[in-house]
Amino acid sequence: VLEVYYTHLRCRCVQESSVFIPRRFIDRIQISPRGNGCPRKEIIVWKKNKSVVCVDPQAEWIQRIMEMLRKKSSSTPPVPVFKRKIP
């Protein structure tokens, strides 16, 4: 569900939304940390209806979801190099 990508691409999000998406409708979350050509952290959400949206990292609801996913993944060993997928 949660992926962290370290790429050498520029920013991919033109605009960000803070509109709430319940986790039941989220298929996958991708996080691109600040740096590597983009001055800001980016969060991209793939929804169950196949649409994709960039989410404001400051939105409280996305922070809650990511915190829950991090807690859930703390018992599983990390996936090495470039891409970290948190089930």
Partner: antibody, heavy 123, light 106 residues
Framework: EVQLVESGGGLVQPGGSLRLSCAAS????????MSWVRQAPGKGLEWVAT????????YYPDNVKGRFTISRDNAKNSLYLQMNSLRAEDTAVYYC????????????????WGQGTLVTVSS | DIQMTQSPSSLSASVGDRVTITCKAS??????IAWYQQKPGKAPKLLIH???TLQPGIPSRFSGSGSGTDFTFTISSLQPEDFATYYC????????FGGGTKLEIK
């Protein structure tokens, strides 16, 4: 008081179409996602569709995807379900239900339901 | 898709009895389960959400527990108005209802 009133049900032949409506009152309709849930005679509940508060996102289970379309008109406080290519197995009472509060971040499920409208698909 | 296995499918009990219904999810749904009561010819009524949070106005004799894949709904002391059909709903990944439990008078 939250009120949801469904209409538009009736008898339709297999392969036919029907449009259900749900009139909402007693809450700020445009702030809530809305869903349709159905119940075949003597059977359990089955989720049919959900639409986000602004109407930009819709979600369906595989068995109705491509046949059913959920929509809403926030100016009229109304929810709709367009049903095409109807089959005998679509026969059910169709309930309109209020879903999550779109302006918040609570993972709440459907809380208020209408009394339902009966759709019968038969030749 | 997540499956919800609800048991028993029917149950006979008497006023004052303690009644327990279980729902088992085919995968981890965290605590995202709700319980509904439905009476014949009526719409479902939400009793509990997020496993154990009681809806406003719902009597405290209704309770829920569990996490992950195994969940329990309990009525501590059955009242005459509690005889109905009960459904669980998972809302962690889209929506799936359990098959229902018909609670009848013994």
């Amino acid at each position: 008081e939250v009120q949801l009133v469904e209409s538009g049900g009736g008898l339709v032949q297999p392969g036919g179409s029907l449009r259900l409506s749900c009139a909402a009152s007693g809450f700020t309709f445009s702030s809530y996602a809305m869903s349709w849930v159905r119940q075949a005679p003597g059977k359990g509940l089955e989720w049919v569709a959900t639409i986000s508060e602004g109407g930009s996102d819709a979600y369906y289970p595989d068995n109705v995807k491509g046949r059913f379309t959920i929509s809403r008109d926030n100016a009229k406080n109304s929810l709709y379900l367009q049903m095409n290519s109807l089959r005998a197995e679509d026969t059910a009472v169709y309930y309109c239900a209020r879903d999550y509060y779109g302006s918040g971040y609570e993972e709440s499920p459907m809380d208020y339901w209408g009394q339902g409208t009966l759709v019968t698909v038969s030749s | 898709d997540i499956q919800m296995t609800q048991s028993p499918s029917s149950l006979s009990a008497s006023v004052g009895d303690r009644v327990t219904i279980t729902c088992k999810a085919s995968q981890d749904i965290n605590k995202y389960i709700a319980w509904y009561q439905q009476k014949p010819g009526k719409a479902p009524k939400l009793l509990i959400h997020y496993t154990s949070t009681l809806q406003p106005g719902i009597p405290s004799r209704f309770s829920g527990s569990g996490s992950g894949t195994d969940f329990t709904f309990t009525i501590s002391s059955l009242q005459p108005e509690d005889f109905a059909t009960y459904y669980c709903l998972q809302y962690d990944n889209l929506y799936t209802f359990g098959g229902g439990t018909k609670l009848e008078i013994k």
